[in-house]
Amino acid sequence: LNTTVLQGMAGQSLRVSCTYDALKHWGRRKAWCRQLGEEGPCQRVVSTHGVWLLAFLKKRNGSTVIADDTLAGTVTITLKNLQAGDAGLYQCQSLRGREAEVLQKVLVEVLEDPLDDQDAGDLWVPEESSSFEGAQVEHSTSRNQETSFPPTS
């Protein structure tokens, strides 16, 4: 899987949308995890509702919120009040029993507010970064690589 790079301004919110095949992942919960090192395990941050029919309800862990539109095939993660420590590599996952299929890898980069930094120079900030849910720049996108599970009875 290629990695999507998203940038957000410190102190603002960053919204991540991971799309998936709604039929293939029908009935599966989703999770957002933080990868510990390049080849290390992925530590669960937050997962969607324990009742799949209620996946659209927002679930929160600290400043991270997740909700899943299972009909559209889009799981949305919002990192609120972004901090420098939130920078790093994350994964959107689809859960099936104890197995987790990676839907998307996301590299989160946190930009310091130029107004707070005299040496910021000519750092370009996207126009939408002033919105509460904004401050996201997608530098590269990739189609999700399909990983198939063996059929279950």
Partner: antibody, heavy 128, light 107 residues
Framework: QVQLQQSGPGLVKPSQTLSLTCAIS??????????WNWIRQSPSRGLEWLGH?????????EYAVSVKSRITINPDTSKNQFSLQLNSVTPEDTAVYYC??????????????????WGQGTLVTVSS | DIQMTQSPSSLSASVGDRVTITCRAS??????LNWYQQKPGKAPKLLIY???NLQSGVPSRFSGSGSGTDFTLTISSLQPEDFATYYC?????????FGQGTKVEIK
């Protein structure tokens, strides 16, 4: 207004199958903004959620762990109703059984899930 | 399953009293909690959903609060029709569960 009308036998023999039906008026069993539940109540176990069914481009059901191996909830779209089947019953399954609509709060990213409309209840006794 | 523990299991109160019922979850459930009222021989009736939202048609003397593991149902001024059994219910877990109930009786 939305109403749920339950029907089914009040006496079932041990080891047999308990079958109840819940007829919906004023809403659709295929609605994507609701789920359809079975809940039971007994003096020994109190209120116990058994499971629900909902339509999200196709039918999906979820069951309580305690009855997962014995329960089936099915929709009947032609009659706008849904049913409960509980296999291999024992006297411990004696209870008042309710059907209920599980409703979602406001959109988008709706707030909450709750049982807002209930059937009248059916006392089912498991005895030989 | 998540266990829901209500306290007290019963209480005696007079008309006009302020009544508080608590519900504790065995693990954090955010605000995924509802409150119901049940009278003998009747189905439960929804009062409060998502911890603090008053269901349409329910009198404003009923209110709910709490988040995480500790929740409260308050009746600000008890009325004769409020004598009943009250239940909390969580929907965080794949097996939704109810509390054992709190019976509010006339003193």
């Amino acid at each position: 207004q939305v109403q749920l009308q339950q029907s089914g036998p009040g006496l079932v023999k041990p080891s047999q199958t308990l079958s109840l039906t819940c007829a919906i008026s004023g809403d659709s069993v295929s609605s994507s903004s609701a789920a359809w539940n079975w809940i039971r109540q007994s003096p020994s176990r109190g209120l116990e959620w058994l499971g629900h069914i909902g339509y999200r481009s196709k039918w999906y059901n979820e069951y309580a762990v305690s009855v997962k191996s014995r329960i089936t909830i099915n929709p009947d779209t032609s009659k706008n109703q849904f049913s409960l089947q509980l296999n291999s019953v024992t006297p411990e399954d004696t209870a008042v059984y309710y059907c209920a609509r599980g409703m979602y709060g406001s959109v988008p990213y709706k707030e909450g899930y709750y049982f807002d409309i209930w059937g009248q209840g059916t006392l089912v006794t498991v005895s030989s | 399953d998540i266990q829901m523990t209500q306290s007290p299991s019963s209480l005696s109160a007079s008309v006009g009293d302020r009544v508080t019922i608590t519900c504790r979850a065995s693990q954090g459930i955010s605000s995924d909690l509802n409150w119901y009222q049940q009278k003998p021989g009747k189905a439960p009736k929804l009062l409060i959903y998502a911890a603090s939202n008053l269901q349409s048609g329910v009198p404003s003397r009923f209110s709910g609060s709490g988040s995480g593991t500790d929740f409260t149902l308050t009746i600000s001024s008890l009325q004769p029709e409020d004598f009943a059994t009250y239940y909390c219910q969580q929907y965080t877990d794949e097996s939704m569960t109810f509390g054992q109930g709190t019976k509010v009786e006339i003193k």
